[in-house]
């Protein structure tokens, strides 16, 4: 019995519903009374959802899963996972038994977009060319961990003196803080790009430093 699942991971946004596709080819005369369907976590073998003896046996996974009962007879054994959480990420095995059995695993990749970065400077007033400042780029509640890039106004990458930290909250979402230390020129723009590698989503923030001497009251920051 051949069981088919997508080769590529299923990508789901945190808080949305995901469908883990799984299908099989029922033989002529197949009835649901013959079907034994098990969804389980591939690594831990924890039961997620099952169908046996012609009946949906229900969710064993925080009541957030459902089958597509009207489609089972056609060989659609897909699983709906509701309100996806970071902790759901991983591999799910679909095990189908009729007379023979087949099993296959589908990967769930969870993602959450990063917020538009906020930019802060320290110090943020009485600045002059030649001063060393730290520019902090902060972006929140994304998943998985971000890639952070800095560049100047001409698009030249700034790689030296960058320190990036990422901290997960209780939901597993990451807050990213990246600090760039630079020596000020007469003027300049410094941009931070926070990229979600799964969603290929870029969040941009920049700050432009102008004037001589330069002062940065809070309302001069460009967000």
């Amino acid at each position: 019995l051949e069981v088919q699942v997508p080769e590529d991971p299923v990508v789901a946004l945190v808080g949305t519903d995901a469908t883990l596709c799984c299908s099989f080819s029922p033989e002529p005369g197949f009835s649901l009374a013959q079907l034994n369907l098990i969804w389980q976590l591939t690594d831990t073998k924890q039961l997620v959802h099952s169908f046996a003896e012609g009946q949906d046996q229900g969710s064993a996974y925080a009541n957030r899963t459902a089958l597509f009962p009207d489609l089972l007879a056609q060989g659609n054994a897909s699983l709906r996972l509701q309100r996806v959480r970071v902790a759901d990420e991983g591999s799910f095995t679909c095990f189908v038994s009729i007379r023979d059995f087949g099993s296959a695993a589908v990967s769930l990749q969870v993602a959450a977009p990063y917020s538009k970065p906020s930019m802060t400077l320290e110090p943020n007033k009485d600045l002059r060319p030649g001063d060393t400042v730290t520019i902090t780029c902060s972006s929140y509640r994304g998943y998985p961990e971000a890639e952070v890039f800095w560049q100047d106004g001409q698009g030249v990458p700034l790689t030296g003196n960058v320190t990036t930290s990422q901290m997960a909250n209780e939901q597993g979402l990451f807050d990213v803080h990246s600090v760039l230390r630079v020596v000020l020129g007469a003027n300049g723009t410094y941009s931070c790009l926070v990229r979600n590698p799964v969603l290929q989503q870029d969040a941009h923030g920049s700050v432009t430093i102008t004037g001589q001497p330069m002062t940065f009251p809070h309302h001069h920051h460009h967000h």
């Epitope: 069981v3 073998k45 095995t93 023979d100 087949g102 296959a104």
Partner: antibody
Framework: EVQLLESGGGLVQPGGSLRLSCAAS????????MNWVRQAPGKGLEWVSG????????YYADSVQGRFTISRDNSKNTLYLQMNSLRAEDTAVYYC?????????????WGQGTLVTVSS | EIVLTQSPGTLSLSPGERATLSCRAS???????LAWYQQKPGQAPSLLIY???SRATGIPDRFSGSGSGTDFTLTISSLEPEDFAVFYC?????????FGGGTKVEIK
């Protein structure tokens, strides 16, 4: 400690019958799929049959379908293989093998095997 | 059914050498549902690797598995005297479950 002990092998004539048993201990028997795997003299491994933990689902290799019946008695922690209409090509060492879980049919524990010889 | 072809049939090596065993499937094995076993003369097989790359309990780290889809490899990084045996791959994605024909690793 997981232990699997096969018994019931022996010499039988073509067309005859044998019943193999496998006594299991050291694990929760009813939670695991169980299997029979055989090995003809000097040959490789061949899966014969498998059964789910509850006994509700059974699976067979094409070469034994309709002739062999796998069953289990979870109250006795025992696996069985009823072999009918035996043929010379069924001659092999028969191993009882425990599946890693209820639905992962690879084998983390094996018995030492019992020899079945089909010959006139 | 899924046919597994192992190569080479025999591998003649010395202790301390690296052994590379191949297992090729006739069709894609979903999600690396492939296991490797070692069998010594007069003994039952014993599980080495499952999930194509996960070592079974108590298996030394000189044994490693890799591969996906249709091509899988068992590597023994440095052969110990007790490693010489016959090695079998097995797919557990579909019934009927199938084994490869085996690779004998013998002392050169």
């Amino acid at each position: 400690e997981v232990q699997l002990l096969e018994s019931g092998g022996g010499l039988v004539q073509p067309g005859g019958s044998l019943r193999l048993s496998c006594a299991a201990s050291g694990f929760t028997f009813s939670s695991y799929a169980m299997n029979w795997v055989r090995q003809a003299p000097g040959k490789g491994l061949e899966w014969v049959s498998g059964i789910s933990g509850s006994g509700g689902s059974t699976y067979y290799a094409d070469s034994v379908q309709g002739r062999f019946t796998i069953s289990r008695d979870n109250s006795k922690n025992t696996l069985y293989l009823q072999m009918n209409s035996l043929r010379a090509e069924d001659t092999a060492v028969y191993y009882c093998a425990k599946a890693r879980s209820g639905y992962d049919y690879f084998f983390d524990y094996w018995g030492q095997g019992t020899l079945v010889t089909v010959s006139s | 059914e899924i046919v597994l072809t192992q190569s080479p049939g025999t591998l003649s090596l010395s202790p301390g050498e690296r052994a590379t065993l191949s297992c090729r499937a006739s069709q894609r094995i979903s999600s690396s549902f492939l296991a490797w076993y070692q069998q010594k003369p007069g003994q039952a097989p014993s599980l080495l690797i499952y999930g194509a790359s996960s070592r079974a309990t108590g298996i030394p780290d000189r044994f490693s598995g890799s591969g996906s889809g249709t091509d899988f490899t068992l590597t023994i990084s440095s052969l110990e005297p007790e490693d010489f045996a016959v090695f079998y791959c097995q797919q557990y994605s579909n019934s009927p479950l199938t084994f490869g024909g085996g690779t004998k690793v013998e002392i050169k």
